[in-house]
């Protein structure tokens, strides 16, 4: 995840719990990886300017057959206004960077991380 | 100097709602993840809820069952806390926080 | 959540000595970003509570530097190298690395 500035709105406002149940999961994946995360597929990595679910969504869409990350796909699915499906490209990716989903996953779960640290414990 | 202020405590009665609000000044509000944190008459202090620099993104501890809403206005350096459905336990001293904290406000929940 | 554990609960001191409070946590704070996430406040008598120390070591301004936060992992100590009459009041830990953020539940420093 390259850039971790300007939080954009996402869109439709996602529940109270959303945000809470994402770190929650991506915390679970993240603990209970053994193999490496779907095979080592490698994923776009994003640009966080901009809606962070969708972004997030349209890098991860792209690897099936993972179970370890349906429920994530699942959630940002929930949370992204907008239809997303595989093989689709906007502007929210690195278009020259590409990560394994294991770091991908770690990276999401660090940002989201800090966007309520800033000031707090630093 | 950063400076805190949170305004709307007040004695209430269960089931009832209040909106805390917290006024910053002495720091550029709009680039600061926000928190409120409160104090209960036993001196425990729990995190109640947290809001990104933009406002786009908040989390609840799971604790909060969902009955509180943080929220902020940039352009007028504000956070707020709307409270509902308010139980005894919630009763407490609110702190708004950001490194610094504020000198709290007292909301106290009873028939 | 991560239980954040302080010990002791009371801590009285003569002026001028020094003092040591511990806080030991659930599970290790040590984030995958290499960064501790764990704070210090003092809540002086009647007063709310005020940051000390961030990210474990890290003094906040205008903090006398007789204040010094140590630790990694799990184990984390905040030590008074001569308590001063202001420094009393109760000190908390407070983690940022697993959310929800957790808090210790207070070691109150008393003046001898």
């Known amino acids: 995840l390259t850039c971790l500035g300007g939080f954009a709105s996402p869109g439709p406002v996602p529940p109270s719990t959303a945000l809470r149940e994402l770190i929650e999961e991506l915390v679970n994946i993240t603990q209970n990886q053994k193999a490496p995360l779907c095979n080592g597929s490698m994923v776009w990595s994003i640009n966080l300017t901009a809606g962070m679910y969708c972004a997030a969504l349209e890098s991860l869409i792209n690897v099936s057959g993972c179970s370890a990350i349906e429920k994530t796909q699942r959630m940002l699915s929930g949370f992204c206004p907008h239809k997303v499906s595989a093989g689709q490209f906007s502007s929210l990716h690195v278009r020259d960077t590409k990560i394994e989903v294991a770091q991908f996953v770690k990276d999401l779960l660090l940002h989201l991380k800090k966007l309520f640290r800033e000031g707090q414990f630093n | 100097e950063v400076q805190l202020v949170e305004s709307g405590g007040g004695l209430v009665k269960p089931g009832g709602s209040l909106k805390l609000s917290c006024a910053a000044s002495?720091?550029?509000?709009?680039?600061?993840?926000m928190s409120w944190v409160r104090q209960t008459p036993e001196k425990r202090l729990e995190w109640v809820a947290g809001?990104?620099?933009?406002?786009?993104?908040?989390y609840y501890p799971e604790t909060m069952k969902g009955r509180f809403t943080i929220s902020r206005d940039n352009a007028r350096n504000t956070l707020y806390l709307q409270m509902s459905s308010l139980r005894s336990e919630d009763t407490a001293i609110y702190y708004c926080?950001?490194?610094?904290w504020g000198q709290g406000t007292s909301v106290t929940v009873s028939s | 959540d991560v239980v954040l554990t302080q010990t002791p609960l009371t801590l009285s001191v003569t002026i001028g000595q020094p003092a040591s409070i511990s806080c030991k946590s659930s599970?290790?704070?040590?984030?995958?970003?290499?960064?501790?996430?764990l704070n210090w406040l003092l809540q002086r008598p009647g007063q709310s509570p005020k940051r000390l120390i961030y990210?474990?070591?890290k003094l906040d301004s205008g903090v006398p530097d007789r204040f010094t936060g140590s630790g990694s992992g799990t184990d984390f100590t905040l030590k008074i190298s001569r308590v001063e009459a202001e420094d009393l009041g109760v000190y908390y830990c407070?983690?940022?690395?697993?959310?929800?953020?957790?808090f210790g539940g207070g070691t109150k420093l008393e003046i001898k």
């Open positions: 926080t950001r490194g610094s």
């Open positions: 809001i990104s620099s933009g406002g786009s993104y908040t």
């Open positions: 599970q290790s704070l040590l984030d995958s970003d290499g960064e501790t996430y």
């Open positions: 990210l474990v070591s």
């Open positions: 002495g720091f550029t509000f709009s680039t600061y993840a």
């Open positions: 407070w983690q940022g690395t697993h959310f929800p953020w957790t």
